[in-house]
């Protein structure tokens, strides 16, 4: 008896539900009364769930598992695991016995995204070039253990004098603390990137340190070197800072935010007063922070049309400006898969598989692969259409000649968010099964 499971580990986020796919090929005349099905932990053989004597025998695993009773007769023995925990990670064996028997093991890889790192500085006052400072980067509640990278404002890796520690809490989630010791130059940006190696999720933060200098009257305007990435519909902060000279008061400040290319006014502050938003009433300054040299702009309810470069122009006695890029993004939905034709399929038939994913930005990259993970590049047609909001719907069509059976996976990647959404369909000649939605 051939029992089939995915070759790749099933990745599940902590707290979500996961489907461990398993299928078998029932012979003609098969009835559920003949089915004996066991799910167990591969290493310890601990019982997880079973089906015997025509009946679901229930969960033996903290009441968090379920079969798909309506699909069993078609050979779908998949297991639903609810409220996934770190402790669930490992290999699960699907054992099927009718007349013949067979088994296969599927790996569950548990993951949890790391929080946006918080950065602290010690000491954090009266810094001068040549001082040694300790920068701590902390990120919480991720799994598995993170990879931590430090770099300067030019993107050059900083590897010396870094100490990283990771501690697991009772749920098995890790808190990561990474400490960088540096000698300050004239000024510098230090970035910490916390990567989840399973999710390929990067969480990063940076701190810009501008040591005090003897006052020259010069206004140095600083913005992040990297684009600010903002999800459609959320709020974004375009950071901008300047170095106020001693005795500076807000009455002296003249601040303009404008679109870099067209010079269209976005927001301004002059004559000691916030002159308000000139940009659809969706912008705001941080009035309590202006006196300390924080000229950052809050942009609310970000739209695709906001993408581009914004210039922060500061004039006191001296003046200066700098431009910051806003990169807008929207995650793609989980792809839906359709099949044409979808009945009476035989080896040798040509089928058209359509993979559709909606409302993402920017344009997606689409990849097809077979059950073994081998890329399928021939006979693929992908189209992307933007709606009125500028969000893309992607439709990718794969034409294949069926073998005896096969799994076809479609992966829709958002190149900015590095977010992958995937769907798959398994075709087994007669009958055909769609894996349950994860």
């Amino acid at each position: 008896l051939e029992v089939q499971v995915p070759e790749d580990p099933v990745v599940a986020l902590v707290g979500t539900d996961a489907t461990l796919c398993c299928s078998f090929s029932p012979e003609p005349g098969f009835s559920l009364a003949q089915l004996n099905l066991i799910w167990q932990l591969t290493d310890t053989k601990q019982l997880v769930h079973s089906f015997a004597e025509g009946q679901d025998q229930g969960s033996a695993y903290a009441n968090r598992t379920a079969l798909f009773p309506d699909l069993l007769a078609q050979g779908n023995a998949s297991l639903r695991l609810q409220r996934v925990r770190v402790a669930d990670e490992g290999s699960f064996t699907c054992f099927v016995s009718i007349r013949d028997f067979g088994s296969a093991a599927v790996s569950l890889q548990v993951a949890a995204p790391y929080s946006k790192p918080s950065m602290t500085l010690e000491p954090n006052k009266d810094l001068r070039p040549g001082d040694t400072v300790t920068i701590t980067c902390s990120s919480y509640q991720g799994y598995p253990e993170a990879e931590v990278f430090w770099q300067d404002g030019q993107g050059v890796p900083l590897t010396g004098n870094v100490t990283t520690s990771q501690m697991a809490n009772e749920q098995g989630l890790f808190d990561v603390h990474s400490i960088l010791r540096v000698v300050l130059g004239a000024n510098g940006t230090y970035s910490c990137l916390v990567r989840n190696p399973v999710l390929q999720q990067d969480a990063h933060s940076s701190v810009t340190i501008t040591p005090q200098r003897s006052p020259t009257g010069a206004v140095e305007v600083q913005v992040p070197e990297d684009p600010v990435v903002a999800l459609v519909g959320t709020d974004a902060t375009l950071r901008c800072s300047f170095s106020p000279e001693p005795g500076f008061s807000l009455a002296q400040l003249n601040l303009i935010w404008q679109l870099t290319d067209t010079k269209q006014l976005v927001h301004s502050f002059t004559e000691g007063r916030d002159q308000g938003s000139a940009y659809a009433n969706r912008t705001a300054l941080f009035p309590d922070l202006l006196a300390q040299g924080n000229a950052s702009l809050r942009l609310q309810r970000v739209r695709v049309a906001d993408e581009g470069s914004f210039t922060c122009f500061v004039s006191i006695r001296d003046f200066g400006s700098a431009a910051v890029s806003l990169q807008v993004a929207a995650p793609y939905s989980k792809p839906s898969m359709t099949l044409e034709p979808n009945k009476d399929l035989r080896p040798g038939d040509t089928v058209t598989i359509t993979c559709s994913s909606y409302r993402g930005y920017p344009e997606a990259e689409v990849f097809w692969q077979d059950g073994q993970g081998v890329p399928l590049t021939g006979n693929v047609t992908t189209s992307q259409m933007a709606n009125e909001q500028g969000l893309f719907d992607v439709h990718s069509v794969l034409r294949v000649v069926l073998g005896a059976n096969g799994t076809y996976s479609c992966l829709v990647r958002n190149p900015v968010l590095q977010q992958d959404a995937h769907g798959s369909v398994t075709i087994t000649g007669q009958p055909m099964t769609f894996p349950p939605e994860a």
Partner: nanobody
Framework: LVQDGDSLRLSCAAS????????MGWFRQAPGKEREFVAA????????YYADNMEGRFTISRDNAKNTVYLQMSSLRAEDTAVYYC????????????????WGQGTLVTVKP
């Protein structure tokens, strides 16, 4: 006095203060017209600001070692005829005359058609 299409560089030297601590600007006043902003440069020279219709033909620069600010003008035309003033910026917008504390006496540039 220059010909239409010529180039010209104006210089303005300052004394009696810390030149490198101040932003500087150029203005001009054509016959019978109001004085208008041309360009400004920040104290260290890292930022420049131009009137919309001047950018491209005019370039402002400075040499803090020589306490001097320059205005390079190219493709001059008759309508560029004016008295050109150099000024030391105080508090305010670079394009506003009221932001400038000290002014030069001005130099007349005449562009012959």
């Amino acid at each position: 006095l220059v010909q239409d299409g010529d180039s010209l560089r104006l210089s303005c030297a300052a004394s009696g203060g810390t030149f490198s601590s101040y932003a500087m600007g150029w203005f001009r006043q054509a016959p019978g017209k109001e004085r208008e902003f041309v360009a400004a440069i920040s104290s260290e020279g890292g930022s420049t600001y131009y009137a919309d219709n001047m950018e491209g033909r005019f370039t402002i620069s400075r040499d803090n070692a020589k306490n001097t600010v320059y205005l390079q003008m190219s493709s001059l035309r008759a309508e560029d005829t004016a008295v050109y003033y150099c000024a030391v910026k105080g508090v305010g917008w670079p394009q506003e005359q009221a932001s400038y504390d000290y002014w030069g006496q001005g130099t007349l540039v005449t562009v012959k058609p």
